[in-house]
């Protein structure tokens, strides 16, 4: 699998992973104890036909061209978890691995 | 996890899974011996904020609102394989489980 990495200075128009730090404090989410912020990343860019397509299915739908089917869009194709310490709303504090919090790779699907 | 199912008569505008039969014969893909066709399904529809969001990450990116981040798009969130019998281009016929050929669920990511 392959995906492009970009930053705020990139001129890349195609589907790419960009850096993004999520700051829970700035959101006012005080139920999250730790981390205060983390590197989440995000996907942005154009999905020209076949470029970075994750699934053969994407190609097949393009071929079949059903009514209302949009072209593929730039979306996370690989994600990873982070460990968080948080209030669970029942006066308990929980440490847990929260899935799909970090974008590791972007692609077209 | 939850996803909407629609058909060609549905008036649903939100992200939904629609039926789609992929016909390899119609594509002229004669290197596929079997199946000749299969139910692939596809995703289509709008992703209003928070509706059918697969990942907490999607919500966080919306909150952080970085430059160039598009809203979430309607994309497969659960897929399954099919078994296929096909010529592999080296004069061999292969029977194999091909991943991510069928859309089981659609969501916004």
């Amino acid at each position: 699998d392959f995906g492009l990495d970009c930053d705020e200075h990139s001129t890349e128009s195609r589907c790419c992973r960009y850096p993004l730090t999520v700051d829970f404090e700035a959101f006012g989410w005080d139920w999250i104890i730790a981390p205060k912020r983390y590197k989440a990343n995000y996907c942005s860019g154009e999905c020209e036909f076949v470029f970075l397509q994750k699934y053969p299915h994407t190609h097949l739908v393009h071929q079949a061209n059903p009514r209302g089917s949009a072209g593929p869009c730039c979306t996370p194709t690989k994600m990873s978890p982070i460990n968080m310490l948080y209030f669970n709303g029942k006066e308990q504090i929980i440490y847990g691995k929260i899935p799909a919090m970090v974008v590791d790779r972007c692609g077209c699907s | 996890d939850f996803g909407l199912d629609c058909d060609e008569h549905s008036t649903e505008s939100r992200c939904c899974r629609y039926p789609l039969t992929v016909d390899f014969e119609a594509f002229g893909w004669d290197w596929i011996i079997a199946p000749k066709r299969y139910k692939a399904n596809y995703c289509s529809g709008e992703c209003e904020f928070v509706f059918l969001q697969k990942y907490p990450h999607t919500h966080l990116v919306h909150q952080a609102n970085p430059r160039g981040s598009a809203g979430p798009c309607c994309t497969p969130t659960k897929m399954s394989p099919i078994n296929m019998l096909y010529f592999n281009g080296k004069e061999q016929i292969i029977y194999g489980k091909i991943p991510a050929m069928v859309v089981d669920r659609c969501g916004c990511s």
């Epitope: 139920w31 310490l85 929980i94 | -």
Partner: antibody
Framework: EVQLLESGGGLVQPGGSLRLSCAAS????????MSWVRQAPGKGLEWVST????????SYPDSVKGRFTISRDNSKNTLYLQMNSLRAEDTAVYYC?????????WGQGTLVTVSS | DIQMTQSPSSLSASVGDRVTITCKAS??????VAWYQQKPGKAPKLLIY???YRYTGVPSRFSGSGSGTDFTLTISSLQPEDFATYYC?????????FGGGTKVEIK
Amino acid sequence: EVQLLESGGGLVQPGGSLRLSCAASGFTFSSYAMSWVRQAPGKGLEWVSTISSGGSYTSYPDSVKGRFTISRDNSKNTLYLQMNSLRAEDTAVYYCAKQDYAMNYWGQGTLVTVSS
Amino acid sequence: DIQMTQSPSSLSASVGDRVTITCKASQDVSTAVAWYQQKPGKAPKLLIYSASYRYTGVPSRFSGSGSGTDFTLTISSLQPEDFATYYCQQHYSTPWTFGGGTKVEIK
């Protein structure tokens, strides 16, 4: 430099009340959850309570639930522990601590003695 | 509640020795274990959090390992200032609980 200074400890009779304070400096107090931990004389450590950075969420062990109340005043950079219906087994040094994944900075503690 | 059983309760060692302290949780706590050092009459200090992450400013001779139920604090080469009591703590779910402590004394 991070500093946490507890005060308000002392001798109190069983059934009595006491309010502990913890004055914080050297960090952005309103950004961090805070905890209280106690240590009975010659014994180990026992977690007492934690409060979220904004004060909306709290947690306690059963041993103090309903008797102790943690609170904070972010405008004064101060953490509090209101202790009611005190018992002899509440006798301990009470520490306030800055909370991250673990308690990463502790004050020097204030001694609470519950005795008749 | 999750019990944290620490061993040994005390040990004698010399400067330069490699010291290992273990902590066993009564149930799986993932990697949510912290280690603290406490000297007589002083407040505890954080050494390790999330099983293996050394806190800022903690010397590299301190290391933590483990996941699930079994955890270890290792001091690779004991220094004079390391004679103290060490506590493990689970930060997996409240009520947070501490081990009984390990007193490291001079041999």
